[in-house]
């Protein structure tokens, strides 16, 4: 459900949501680590509807949540870490 | 005092539509996320649908997606679940009721319960 | 998807006794479980929510626990007024109900 992106890429998200979304229609969160093109850390979400949106990595339900699964993945595996390349 | 109310429901053939409506009150209903959850006649619980707070997101299981639709009017309070290509198996007590409060971070789930509108599909 | 296990399917005891319902959910769901009660041509009520947590009005002698996969809800003197059908709903990731417990007083 947790993923890390390292990528050279500039900044992914044109405007951010604050908007609670209950963890039970999240597909996968990636997250975006500031540096290397964006100065900003970027938090992706990809919803259970197939739907994709940005959300404001300051928005308390989000740093709630990533707490518990990061909690849960590190009592079964490691948080995958990927680098991608420039297209 | 919380009060959900549904309406629409009735005998059906099977392939027909059907619309059904919830009619919400005694709570700030566009700060809701709304869901409709159906029985079977003498069976269990199932979820049907959901949709957050302010229209944008709908959820559904696999065995209703792409033939129901859940839709909101926030301006009248109200909750509706369109039911296209209907079968036999649909056939049960539909129930709307009040999921997560979409302003706030709390992960609960529905609480308030309207009681129900049956929906028949049988030729 | 996530199944939900519910044992047992019926029960009878009398009024007084201590009442156990179990779910058990085919993975892991943290303690996303809600426990509801149905009376007969009613619609249900949420009685405990996140594992442990009371629905405001709801009578202490309703308990819930349990964590993982795991979970238990207790009725801890039985009252004639909690005869019932109760559900269990995981909403980990979507919803998935139980089937239910049908609950009689001997």
């Known amino acids: 459900v947790l993923e890390v992106y390292y990528t050279s890429l500039r900044c992914r998200c044109v405007q951010e949501s604050s908007v609670f979304i209950p963890r039970r229609f999240i597909d996968r969160i990636q997250i975006l680590p500031r540096g290397n093109g964006c100065p900003r850390k970027e938090i992706i979400v990809w919803k259970k509807n197939k739907s994709i949106v940005c959300v404001d990595p300051q928005a308390e339900w989000i740093q709630r949540m990533m707490e518990v699964l990061r909690k849960r993945s590190s009592s079964t595996l490691p948080v995958p870490v990927f680098k991608r390349k420039i297209p | 005092e919380v009060q959900l109310v549904e309406s629409g429901g009735g005998l059906v053939q099977p392939g027909g539509s059907l619309r059904l409506s919830c009619a919400a009150s005694?709570?700030?209903?566009?700060?809701?996320?709304m869901s409709w959850v159906r029985q079977a006649p003498g069976k269990g619980l199932e979820w049907v649908a959901t949709?957050?707070?302010?229209?944008?997101?709908?959820y559904y299981p696999d065995n209703v997606k792409g033939r129901f639709t859940i839709s909101r009017d926030n301006a009248k309070n109200s909750l509706y679940l369109q039911m296209n290509s209907l079968r036999a198996e649909d056939t049960a007590v539909y129930y709307c009721?009040?999921?997560?409060?979409?302003?706030?971070?709390?992960?609960?789930?529905?609480?308030?319960w309207g009681q129900g509108t049956l929906v028949t599909v049988s030729s | 998807d996530i199944q939900m296990t519910q044992s047992p399917s019926s029960l009878s005891a009398s009024v007084g006794d201590r009442v156990t319902i179990t779910c058990k959910a085919s993975q892991d769901i943290n303690k996303y479980i809600a426990w509801y009660q149905q009376k007969p041509g009613k619609a249900p009520k949420l009685l405990i929510y996140y594992t442990s947590t009371l629905q405001p009005g709801v009578p202490s002698r309703f308990s819930g626990s349990g964590s993982g996969t795991d979970f238990t809800f207790t009725i801890s003197s039985l009252q004639p007024e909690d005869i019932a059908t109760y559900y269990c709903?995981?909403?980990?990731?979507?919803?998935?109900f139980g089937g239910g417990t049908k609950l009689e007083i001997k």
């Open positions: 009721a009040r999921d997560y409060y979409g302003s706030g971070y709390e992960d609960s789930p529905m609480d308030y």
């Open positions: 005694g709570f700030t209903f566009s700060s809701y996320a």
């Open positions: 949709i957050s707070d302010g229209g944008s997101d709908a």
């Open positions: 709903l995981q909403y980990d990731n979507l919803y998935t």
